[in-house]
Every structure is written in C-alpha cells, then in structure tokens.
C-alpha cells in the first residue's frame, strides 16, 4: 500500500567490491524521491541519501564499521514535493533489500602485480596490498589486514614461449617460484577466499611479463 502516485522501489541490489558498497534499485523516479535506511540485525535504522532522485546510495561508511555484521537496507518512496505524505497504513512505502554480510559477500577487486624480481633461477613476485575503506584506529586497512589468512593469492605463470600455466599460491602477498634460467616468464594473479561459496575469486590481474618495466633481474 502507498500513496496513489508513488511506487515502491524494486530490484534492490548490493554492489560491493573491496568493501566499497553501494545499494542500487529501480525504478528511475517519476514524481517521487527516495530515502535509504540501513541497520544491522540487532541495531537501529540509520537514514542515508535523504530524498534523493538517484537510484543508488553509497553505504560504505556504514558497513565498514563492522564488516562481519549482517546488514539490511530499505528504500522509502515519497511523492516529490510532499515528503511528509504517507501511505494508507500511515507510513511511507518501502522495500527491503536482501541481507548483506560484507566479509562474506564483497567482491574481490582485480589485484595488481606490484613487482617481480629475478635472482638466478628464483623469481619473487609481489602483489599490491590494496587499501580498503575499512578503518581501524583512524587508519585505512589493507585487504590483507581485513581478511588475514582467509585471503589466498593464486599466481599463474608461464614461459613467454609456451601456453601452459603453472600455479603457485600464497597466504601472504609474495610468491617465490622456480624458473628456468634464460627464459622469460609472464605472470597474472587472482585473489581467492577459499572458505566462501560465492564471490570466491577476483578477476585476474593484468598480465606482467619479464623484460618489462616492473621487473628487475640480478644474477
């Protein structure tokens, strides 16, 4: 139920990568505006994105307070120019989002290979530890800070002259792999959270190859 010229939001969807979290919904408003509320299961509702004509609301600041909590959001619809108006049940029309637990559900962003260094037949490959918007003691935490050993990186590496991809894994941000002397190798990494059943993997990092800028070679 609601006012005659107001429609409820629908298709409420969480879009979240490395904890940057936006709630999206439909429809594009015609003569109406929206306000979003967010709450943990046991907490109070907090209003965000007041009387907006957007169909998205950035809720990052709220969810980063505790990424292991489960959140619920709701989107209220109001007639444009008459936001005090309520539905026939005495309150504005609203729609609930699905539940969202950032720690379990945020997508893993595309990782970046920070550097690689060859020493003889060993190559050390370092993955950039991306900063998130999660804070602790007024400091932004990295992805590794947040996920700890739950976060694995898989390295795919291959000789420039061949197609078969070998793999290595680490629960730090560094790999030390054996390579054949005199061969050039290419590298790509993928972030993985093996304990998850959904959103387990990131997309692959851009490929980096030996003989390019990021690398360093020492005998």
């Amino acid at each position: 139920s609601g006012t005659t010229n107001t429609v409820a939001a629908y298709n409420l969807t969480w879009k979240s990568t490395n904890f940057k979290t936006i709630l999206e919904w439909e429809p594009k408003p015609v003569n109406q505006v929206y306000t979003v509320q967010i709450s943990t299961k046991s907490g109070d509702w907090k209003s965000k994105c007041f009387y907006t004509t957007d169909t998205e609301c950035d809720l990052t600041d709220e969810i980063v307070k505790d990424v292991k909590q489960t959140y619920l959001a709701r989107v209220f619809s109001y007639p444009a120019g008459n936001v005090e108006s309520t539905g026939s049940a005495g309150e504005p029309l609203y729609e609930n989002s699905p539940e969202f637990t950032p720690y379990l559900e945020t997508n893993l962003g595309q990782p970046t290979i920070q550097s690689f260094e060859q020493v003889g037949t060993k190559v050390n490959v370092t993955v950039e530890d991306e900063r998130t918007l999660v804070r602790r003691n007024n400091t932004f935490l990295s992805l590794r800070d947040v996920f700890g050993k739950d976060l694995i990186y898989t390295l795919y590496y291959w000789k420039s002259s061949s197609s078969g991809k070998k793999t290595a894994k680490t629960n730090t941000n560094e790999f030390l792999i054996d390579v054949d002397k005199g061969e050039n190798y290419c590298f790509s990494v993928q972030a993985v959270i093996p304990s998850r059943t959904v959103n387990r993997k990131s997309t692959d990092s851009p490929v980096e190859c030996m003989g390019q800028e990021k690398g360093e070679f020492r005998e």
Partner: antibody, heavy 120, light 107 residues
Framework: EVQLVESGGGLVQPGGSLRLSCAAS????????IHWVRQAPGKGLEWVGY????????YYADSVKGRFTISADTSKNTAYLQMNSLRAEDTAVYYC?????????????WGQGTLVTVSS | DIQMTQSPSSLSASVGDRVTITCRAS??????VAWYQQKPGKAPKLLIY???FLYSGVPSRFSGSRSGTDFTLTISSLQPEDFATYYC?????????FGQGTKVEIK
Amino acid sequence: EVQLVESGGGLVQPGGSLRLSCAASGFTIAYYIIHWVRQAPGKGLEWVGYIDPSNGYTYYADSVKGRFTISADTSKNTAYLQMNSLRAEDTAVYYCARDDQSLSSPFDYWGQGTLVTVSS
Amino acid sequence: DIQMTQSPSSLSASVGDRVTITCRASQDVNTAVAWYQQKPGKAPKLLIYSASFLYSGVPSRFSGSRSGTDFTLTISSLQPEDFATYYCQQHYTTPPTFGQGTKVEIK
C-alpha cells in the same frame, strides 16, 4: 549437494578421438579449478591436466601435452576433456575432480569416473 | 616435477592395528600434501589436507603429520572399512603429483 558426473567414455581405436564431459552440480565451476586424473587398470593415480574455468588457463601432463585439450562451458557448468591421437597407454578410468584453490588445494570432490579403452 | 615416493607399496594388518604410511617429497612442498583413500571400483576420497588437517566427515583415527619433506598418514586403530589403497599427493607446484599408492590388506 556437490556432485561431479563424468560421461563419454568407451571403446576407441588407436589414433581415434573421444570427448569426455564432467557435469558439475551443487557448486559453480567458475569459482574453482577442475582437474582430470586417470588410473590405468591396476595402476596408481596419474594427473592429466587442469582448467581454471574463470579464465580458461590450462596445464597438461607431459604424457598428454599436444594430444589432449581441457575446456569448460561455465553456462553449462561443465568441463570437457578432448582426447585426440589416442594410444593404448591412454586406457584408463578418467576422473574429474574439484580443487578448492586453497593453499594446499586438495581435490575435495571427485566424479565416479568413466572408462576409456583404446584398442583395435 | 616433484616426485612423491610412497612406502610401503603394500602392507598386511589386522583390525585394531596401528598403521603408518609415509611419503617423501623430492623437494620442499611446504604443507601442501593431501592423502586419499580409494576402494576398488570407486573414486578416491579426501582424508587429510594441508599435511595434517582432517577433512570433514573423516573418522578421527586418521591423522597426518609432516617432518620436513617427509609426510605420514597414520590409522590409529584399523577398522574393517579401512582396507583400501591410500595415496599421497603434493599440490605445492604444477603439476600436482601422486605417490604410487599403498594397498592395506587384511592379514
């Protein structure tokens, strides 16, 4: 319930081809790595190759390199093993297995296997 | 490629016996070793992962340990359903490799 079901095995002549399928249910193959492992009659387990369905990356055992090709169709949640130029020594039960891509990457689920016999 | 040398290739034991199977890696594999049980005509089943972690649903009489590049599977008190072939496997580097297998038979 996680399940892997292989199919496509059978009798084939030396030099012939066969395509095995590994249909997955209860999980999404794009989130895992799929391996093929074979076992010749009365012998041990031999790793054949893997595919990461999320990017198509593969690697093969030397014994099958250039003859076997692993592919995946994420829309069908199925992995495939295309076997060409088959030899008598390729006779085996072929298993697909799921790799959870953790640090130690055990093969936590296996299919029931499908028998490939290469004989004239 | 890393070789996994498994011993013994077979052993005879009685119900209630303590059974130990070992695998030696040809180079460092950290703890990236798994153990599998296989019964005739069936697919292998995961028992132990990361050298010493018991897989979900596996009885606690099975245990795994590591000492350097040596890995051990122990069955503390052999049960009738444990007569099978056991394989170790390393997945530290590509290609993953299996041991030759140990057949545990009834004495």
